[in-house]
């Protein structure tokens, strides 16, 4: 190499990461085996769970605004779960990314896409719930499945837009021990006249922007929406929260618990550029909190089912029945403050023909078994428990 051959410029924290060498320590190998096993199991669970949720909610249930939100959340989680097997492979081959730079960029982008999409969708769900209670007339006139899908498309577009920097600055970096890292390289594009300044500003910008946009702002929206709803419902003398409220509360709690530590370590990592003493803590902690964030996608489908009241009794029924009872929309139940009668205009709007899959006339072969497990697929949308609940009071 000539004296002037500039090596791939790396930020100090990244270059120091590239110098970390693997240990042949036995206890560490056991931890690695356990991690591979855990991530492999999470991959499988996540794919199956989210696949089932998508299938049941999208194909086997009458489409409502609530099912639309859940559908898009499950789609985001399915994407994240689909990328988990590759992360598991990365762990299995000794923490080395052997799948190339392009796939490194794509894989990482899915993680961030899920992060932004989850935050945005949970914000939308909370705002939707708020509008239902605070502006019931407006909600009754504008709250349609088609509108919910449009909102989701906008949120997906925003999530994609926010993911672009993570796609651009993701890179494969060879470690000195031969392993390959798939990590941020903020000097990859237009490093500017001063690498130290670029490293610092870009690392801070990425960490702070994702903390604000994908975590703090969504949680602020969720909290303020919840406060507004609670205040309004207090005036109406309603005591017990609805089933969907409990579902949202559980999903939001899981989101905060799974993503919170990741953002803390991400901010610490940005701070570690100027404070190298933080680097070992970040290196040790970041893999754990990243896995925890991934596991959010595995936890959500479980929460959709578990937040249903009388869980054990309803688990004996078909999965469709359980999900339908959980995903009952307050507006479709005649929520507090609105009339208890069946609101045909509202339900007609909610049950717009935006179902993702067509309903087969008669299931045959394996489909018959699936139909039995997931509920009768030939059942008329008007006769399901979700519709029977329309005339009942909200629990």
């Amino acid at each position: 190499m000539s004296a002037n051959a500039t090596l791939k410029p790396l930020c100090p924290i990244l270059e120091q990461m590239s110098r970390l060498q693997s240990h042949s320590n036995t206890s560490i190998r056991y931890i690695d085996h356990a991690a591979v096993l855990l991530h492999g199991l999470a991959s499988l669970l996540g794919l199956v769970e989210n696949g089932v949720i998508l299938f049941v909610v999208g194909c086997r249930m009458r489409q409502t605004v609530v099912t639309t939100w859940v559908l898009h959340l499950a789609l985001s989680d399915l994407l994240a779960s689909a990328s988990l097997p590759f992360f598991t492979y990365f762990l299995a081959v000794g923490h080395s990314w052997e799948l190339g730079t392009t796939f490194c960029k794509l894989h990482s982008s899915i993680f961030f896409l899920n992060m932004f999409a989850s935050g945005f969708l949970l914000s939308a769900i909370s705002l939707d719930r708020c509008l239902q209670v605070v502006r019931p007339v407006w909600a009754q006139n504008h709250r349609t499945v088609a509108a919910a899908h449009k909102v989701c498309l906008v949120l997906w577009a925003l999530a994609v837009l926010n993911t672009v920097p993570y796609f651009v600055f993701r890179d494969t970096i060879s470690r000195l021990d031969g392993r390959i890292m798939c990590y941020y390289n903020v000097l990859l594009l237009n490093p500017g006249p001063d690498r130290d300044a670029t490293c610092n500003s870009r690392q801070v910008a990425l960490a702070v922007s994702k903390f604000l946009l994908a975590f703090l702002v969504p949680l602020a929206i969720i909290a303020s929406s919840h406060a507004a709803v609670s205040l309004r419902l207090q005036h109406r003398g309603r005591r017990r929260p609805g089933r969907f409220v409990r579902l949202v509360a559980a999903v939001v709690a899981a989101f905060a618990l799974c993503w919170g530590p990741y953002h803390v370590f991400s901010l610490l990592e940005a701070r570690a550029h100027a404070n190298p003493g933080l680097r070992p803590l970040v290196w040790r902690g970041l893999p754990f909190v990243t896995s925890l964030a991934f596991f959010n996608s595995v936890a959500n489908p479980v929460l959709y089912v578990l937040t249903c009241p009388d869980m054990l009794r309803k688990l004996r029924r078909s999965l469709r029945t359980v999900l339908e009872s959980v995903l009952v929309d307050d507006s479709e139940l005649g929520g507090a403050g609105s009339s208890r009668r069946r609101r045909t205009s509202s339900t007609a709007r909610s049950a717009s023909p935006l179902a993702l899959c067509s309903r087969p006339e008669e299931p045959r072969g394996p489909a018959r078994l699936l139909g039995w497990l997931l509920g009768s697929c030939a059942a008329s949308p008007q006769t399901g428990p979700l519709n029977r609940a329309l005339s009942s009071t909200s629990s």
Epitope: L10, D194, D196, A197
Partner: antibody
Framework: EVQLVESGGGLVQPGGSLRLSCAAS????????MSWVRQAPGKGLEWVAY????????DYPGTVEGRFTISRDNSKNTLYLQMNSLRAEDTAVYYC???????????WGQGTLVTVSS | DIQMTQSPSSLSASVGDRVTITCRAS??????LAWYQQKPGKAPKLLIY???QLADGVPSRFSGSGSGTDYTLTISSLQPEDFATYYC?????????FGQGTKVEIK
């Protein structure tokens, strides 16, 4: 061929000031971080100042902080070390060194002797 | 500040000998260590960076190893031109400090 040539050394009284220069050639100066390292007669090496490739970041050990200032002029391919409030213990050969990446001094100048004595 | 302790401070060896110089840091430096060779009246020369990596143009008889706080420079077969003073330096947290040096002399 990479070349680093220091100049500006000499005899100075305690409390006095001196400005060292390091002329760089044979490489793209603005792409590399630089440092000054000194060696007292018959003693070991001591790092005294660091500057990033664009000059936005500087760093010093406690022994010289507040007294020494590192700077660079990328248009002139020159590195500087402004030394104020000099003490007898600052007597040393001062080397300018190029950082291989973020660290590791891969090229050194031949040094310039600074003597602080009354 | 991180202290770098080099040992031995000096050693006598013959051409062809295997020479080992150790460097101990006062805390974990995560492989952020370089080894330099300095001959009298000359500037230091980089031999090893990142604890184990051979710098460009350095003969393969030089090698670096270690992790955590303990690092080693090994010269597998000492050559006449290798008689010099060797320094280790960490690049973990500033101030970047050097070891006090090991002088390798002809026996």
């Amino acid at each position: 061929e990479v070349q680093l040539v220091e100049s500006g050394g000499g005899l100075v009284q305690p409390g006095g000031s001196l400005r060292l220069s390091c002329a760089a050639s044979g490489f793209t100066f603005s792409s590399y971080s630089m440092s000054w390292v000194r060696q007292a007669p018959g003693k070991g090496l001591e790092w005294v100042a660091y500057i990033s490739n664009g000059g936005s970041t500087t760093d010093y050990p406690g022994t010289v902080e507040g007294r020494f200032t590192i700077s660079r002029d990328n248009s002139k391919n020159t590195l500087y070390l402004q030394m104020n409030s000099l003490r007898a213990e600052d007597t040393a050969v001062y080397y300018c060194a190029r950082h291989r990446t973020n660290w590791d001094f891969d090229y050194w100048g031949q040094g310039t002797l600074v003597t602080v004595s009354s | 500040d991180i202290q770098m302790t080099q040992s031995p401070s000096s050693l006598s060896a013959s051409v062809g000998d295997r020479v080992t110089i150790t460097c101990r840091a006062s805390e974990n430096i995560y492989w952020n260590l370089a080894w330099y060779q300095q001959k009298p009246g000359k500037a230091p020369k980089l031999l090893i960076y990142a604890a184990t990596q051979l710098a460009d143009g350095v003969p393969s008889r030089f090698s670096g190893s270690g992790s955590g706080t303990d690092y080693t420079l090994t010269i597998s077969s000492l050559q006449p031109e290798d008689f010099a003073t060797y320094y280790c330096q960490h690049f973990w947290i500033t101030p970047w400090t050097f070891g006090q040096g090991t002088k390798v002399e002809i026996k």
